[in-house]
Amino acid sequence: EEELQVIQPEKSVSVAAGDSATLNCTVSSLIPVGPIQWFRGAGPGRELIYNLKEGHFPRVTPVSDPTKRNNMDFSIRISNITPADAGTYYCVKFRKGSPDVELKSGAGTELSVRAKPSAPVVSGPAVRATAEHTVSFTCESHGFSPRDITLKWFKNGNELSDVQTNVDPAGKSVSYSIRSTARVVLTRRDVHSQVICEVAHVTLQGDPLRGTANLSEAIRVPPFLEVTQQSMRADNQVNVTCQVTKFYPQRLQLTWLENGNVSRTEMASALPENKDGTYNWTSWLLVNVSAHRDDVKLTCQVEHDGQPAVNKSFSVKVSAHPKEQGSNTAAENTGTNER
C-alpha cells in the first residue's frame, strides 16, 4: 500500500497582525484511521494548536468540515494573529490507539507576522551644548516584524551619516526593536533646526513613520557683549549701554556693577525673536558723573542659562569732564566673552 503523505503545500505564510492566517494541510489517504493534530514547533516544547477531538481552541477553526466522511483536508484558520503566533506549524497524523501513536508530520509551514513599528521616539541630550560641539540624539521604535527595517536621520532635510543603529534581538523573535543614535555637530544657526528620525518597514506601505526633535532643546548660543557710551547729557549724566546679542535660550540675567558694587540686576523676559531664533537685549545705565570724583568703572555682567558669568567693563573718565566728552572714555574686557 502507498505510504500516507501529510502535505503542507506552503513552506511559509506571512500575515499582518490582526488578520487571519490559513494553514493548509491535506493527507493522501484515509488509512490508517486516526486523528490529525496541529502543533507549533517540532521539538519537545512543541505546543498543541488544534485537536479536533478534544480541547478548546477559540481562535482556530477548520477550513473544511472535519466530520464529513472522506475528508482529507485538515487546513485550519487562526484568527486575530499577533506577533506571538509566529513560528513553524506542523500538521501531524496519528494512528488511532490507546494512546494514539504519532505517525507522520507535514514538513511545516512557517508563519511570520507582519507587525508595524511603533511611532519613533526621538530624545536629545540631557544638557545643552554650544556651537561646534557634538550632541547625540536617540531614536527608538518597537514591536515590528519582520526584522528588516530601514532607519534614516535627517537634519533640516539633509541625511546624516554619523549614525549607529541596532536591531534587537539579533536572533529569531516574535517582534523586534530598533535603537539608533545620531551625532550632530551644532552651529550657532541651529536654533530653528530639526532632526528627523525616519523609519521604513514593509508594513508601512511606503509611508514611513517619523519622529522629530528640535535642536532648540539641545543648543546654547552664548551672547556677544558690547558696552558703549552714548553722548554726555546736559545734566552731567552719561548713558552707558550694554548690548547682549545673538543668545539662546532666553534665560539670562544682567547685572550692572559700579566700581565693583552691584548697581542693578535685570532678568530677560518676553524678548522678540531674531530671524535665526536667537535673542537680543539692550540695557542702559545712567551714571551721574558729577557725583564721582574719580573715574567710574562700569561692568556689565551677564549670566546666561546657568553658565559662568561673562563680563564687559567700561571706564568713564571723570577727570576730563565736562570738556572732552567724546575722548575721555575707554572700554576694557575683563571677562571671557564666549563666541
Partner: antibody
C-alpha cells in the same frame, strides 16, 4: 536502548555528506532526535531536531546548511555543502519520555573532517 | 539568537568541596523550566544530569543540584569527588523551538 551515529568520514569541501542515526530498543510512541556537533576542543552546538512524525526544525544558523529527515530505520543529517568549519564530531541525541527539552540518550558520535 | 552564558569558564576545587556554575539565558526558557545540565568527559558524549531545571536524571547522585527559573539557573556540585572532573554544559529550550547549549564550564578537582 541506544542510538548510534554512522557515516562520518573525510570529505572535500562542497561534497554533500549524509550521517545516519540508528535507533534501537525503543517502543517508539513518541520521541525527538536532535543533532548536535562539537568541533575539536570546543563546546556543543545544537543543529536541529526531528520528531517521530518527521517534523523537523533547525537552529537559525543551520537552516539551509543541514537537512534532517527520517526514514523507517534512521534519522539522517545531510550536510548540504560542507566547509572546513564543519569539521566536528556529530552526535545524535534522543529525548525519550522527557517533556522538558532534555536529551537523555546520546550516541558515541561520528567524526566528520572537511579538508582538501 | 537565544544565548546561554555560562560562568565561570573554568573552576577548580578540592575533593569534598563545592562548585557552583551559573547559566544565564538571554530570554526566558520555555515554560520557565526547559533547562538541562550535562556532564561531558574527554572523548565521550554528554551525559544528562538534570532536566526541568531541577529534576535529577536517573542514576545521578543527589550531590548534583539544579535550581533557577526563567533566565537564571545554577548547577551546584557538593561533596566533590575526583570523578566529577569534567566539562559541564547547560542547555535551554525555547518557544521558537530551538535547544542551544551554553559555552561550557571546566571543573578541575584538586
Amino acid at each position: 536502548q541506544s542510538v548510534e551515529e554512522s557515516g562520518g568520514r573525510l570529505v572535500t569541501p562542497g561534497t554533500p555528506l549524509t550521517l545516519a542515526c540508528t535507533v534501537s530498543g525503543f517502543s517508539l510512541i513518541s520521541y525527538y532526535i536532535s543533532w548536535v556537533r562539537q568541533a575539536p576542543e570546543k563546546g556543543l552546538e545544537y543543529i536541529g531536531i526531528i520528531n517521530i512524525g518527521g517534523g523537523a526544525s533547525y537552529a537559525s544558523w543551520a537552516k539551509g546548511r543541514f537537512t534532517i529527515s527520517k526514514t523507517s530505520t534512521t534519522v539522517d543529517l545531510k550536510i548540504t555543502s560542507p566547509t572546513p568549519e564543519d569539521t566536528a564530531t556529530y552526535f545524535c541525541a534522543m529525548s525519550y519520555g522527557m517533556d522538558t527539552g532534555a536529551f537523555n540518550i546520546w550516541g558515541p558520535g561520528t567524526l566528520v573532517t572537511v579538508s582538501l | 539568537a537565544q544565548v546561554l552564558t555560562q560562568t565561570p569558564a573554568s573552576v577548580s576545587a578540592a575533593v569534598g568541596g563545592t562548585v557552583t556554575i551559573s547559566c544565564q539565558s538571554s530570554e526566558s526558557v520555555y515554560k520557565n523550566n526547559f533547562l538541562s545540565w550535562y556532564q561531558q568527559k574527554p572523548g565521550k558524549p554528554p551525559k544528562l544530569l538534570i532536566y526541568g531545571a531541577s529534576t535529577l536524571a536517573s542514576g545521578v547522585p543527589s550531590r548534583f543540584k539544579g535550581s533557577g527559573s526563567g533566565t537564571q539557573f545554577t548547577l551546584t556540585i557538593s561533596d566533590l569527588e575526583s570523578d566529577d572532573a569534567a566539562t559541564y554544559f547547560c542547555q535551554g529550550g525555547y518557544r521558537t523551538d530551538i535547544y542551544p547549549f551554553g559555552g561550557g564550564t571546566e571543573v578541575v578537582v584538586k
